[in-house]
């Protein structure tokens, strides 16, 4: 399956649009940081099947248009930015979708593939669990929207190389 | 590899404007903030301040407020730092250095050559 | 702002020698303690981030412990090239502060 370049223009187009949505400076929220332990590992690329990394990569936006789904994330965020961000999102799902359909017939897909799909929801658990402990402050939902931009360059990366495999 | 590369020593007279650079390779230019540290002759490390290059947000230390200017241009990837009016006692060697902004990542973990500034009449 | 103190200064040591430095913060900084390395007419070197996380490619003798207000920089085998000045540096809250430095020379 060849993911389409609308695909990676989606990831940038994303990208742009959750750089767009801070509120607030994040020069205030230094003290805020935390360490949410991203799986970096899982976007390595170079240890996963096809199959296995567009699983990861599908997991990984589900997670993400989860957590921008919730009525704490409307609250937080200008409205019309948040639903440009989430259709983004709607539509990379709908193309890994197709992808890990067309993938999966063609491999078999092991058991090291659900450890990599759990170590990504347990990183979306830490993220939550944090924003929950934070009483969703402004500048918890700063820090978590810079983490996801974080982990979505790490998709990217995911992406670009998954192409250069084909 | 990540780079960041600075302008070279200027010689100026008090009373003179000088922007000096910082150019970032290697790397988002944009995930990252760029902080501007000075070291007087034969002293410690001051940070002066600190620019977001995706919006170009700052911050400055109370002490360099409304002394210099922080600047960046991400079409090209460099920062800048400004003054409008020099003073010798702004002879100092300044260095710029990336910071990972929010996230759980190293501070100031790549640093500029440093750019030498001697102030005299 | 936030102050730190280093101590001691300045320090004079031998080759093989463990060595200690402290850095305090004048109110609570909880982890947010990094420090640097500076060798002269060199630009500073990041060798712990964090408190105690070890930044990539420096030596595992370097070692770096504590949280709140006091912190340690220990380096458990001075080596030739480690003679250097070091300093501590809060990243809890801006402005971002440095230590005044401690030198490190050959006694």
């Known amino acids: 399956c060849d993911l389409p370049q609308t695909h990676s223009l989606g990831n940038r187009r994303a990208l742009i649009l959750l750089g767009q949505m801070g509120r607030i400076s994040p020069f205030s929220c230094l003290k805020d940081r935390h360490d949410f332990r991203i799986p970096q590992e899982e976007f390595d690329g170079n240890q996963f099947q096809k199959a296995q990394a567009i699983s990861v990569l599908h997991e990984m936006i589900q997670q993400t248009f989860n957590l921008f789904s919730t009525e704490d994330s409307s609250a937080a965020w200008e409205q019309s930015l948040l639903e440009k961000f989430s259709t983004e999102l709607y539509q990379q799902l709908n193309d890994l979708e197709a992808c890990v359909i067309q993938e999966v017939g063609v491999e078999e897909t092991p058991l090291m593939n659900e450890d990599s799909i759990l170590a990504v929801r347990k990183y979306f658990q830490r993220i939550t669990l944090y924003l929950i402990e934070r009483k969703y402050s402004p500048c918890a939902w700063e820090v978590v929207r810079a983490e996801i931009m974080r982990s979505l360059s790490f998709s990217t990366n995911l992406q670009k190389r998954l192409r250069r495999k084909d | 590899e990540v780079q960041l590369v600075q302008s070279g020593a200027e010689v100026k007279k008090p009373g003179e404007s000088l922007k000096i650079s910082c150019k970032g390779s290697g790397y988002s230019f944009t995930s990252y903030w760029i902080g501007w540290v000075r070291q007087m002759p034969g002293k410690g490390l001051e940070w002066m301040g600190i620019i977001d290059p995706s919006d170009s947000d700052t911050a400055y230390s109370p002490s360099f407020q409304g002394q210099v200017t922080i600047s960046a241009d991400k079409s090209i990837s460099t920062a800048y730092l400004q003054w409008s009016s020099l003073k010798a006692s702004d002879t100092a060697m300044y260095y710029c250095?990336?910071?990972?902004?929010?996230?759980?990542?190293?501070?100031?973990?790549?640093w500029g050559q440093g750019t030498l500034v001697t102030v005299s009449s | 702002d936030i102050q730190m103190t280093q101590s001691p200064s300045s320090l004079s040591a031998s080759v093989g020698d463990r060595v200690t430095i402290t850095c305090r913060a004048s109110q609570s900084i909880d982890g947010s303690l990094n420090w640097y390395q500076q060798k002269p007419g060199k630009a500073p070197k990041l060798l712990i981030y964090f408190a105690s996380s070890l930044q990539s490619g420096v030596p595992s003798r370097f070692s770096g412990s504590g949280s709140g207000t006091d912190f340690t920089l220990t380096i458990s085998s001075l080596q030739p090239e480690d003679f250097a000045t070091y300093y501590c540096q809060q990243s809890y809250d801006f402005p971002l502060t440095f230590g005044q430095g401690t030198k490190v020379e050959i006694k």
């Open positions: 250095a990336r910071h990972p902004g929010l996230n759980w990542a190293p501070d100031f973990d790549y």
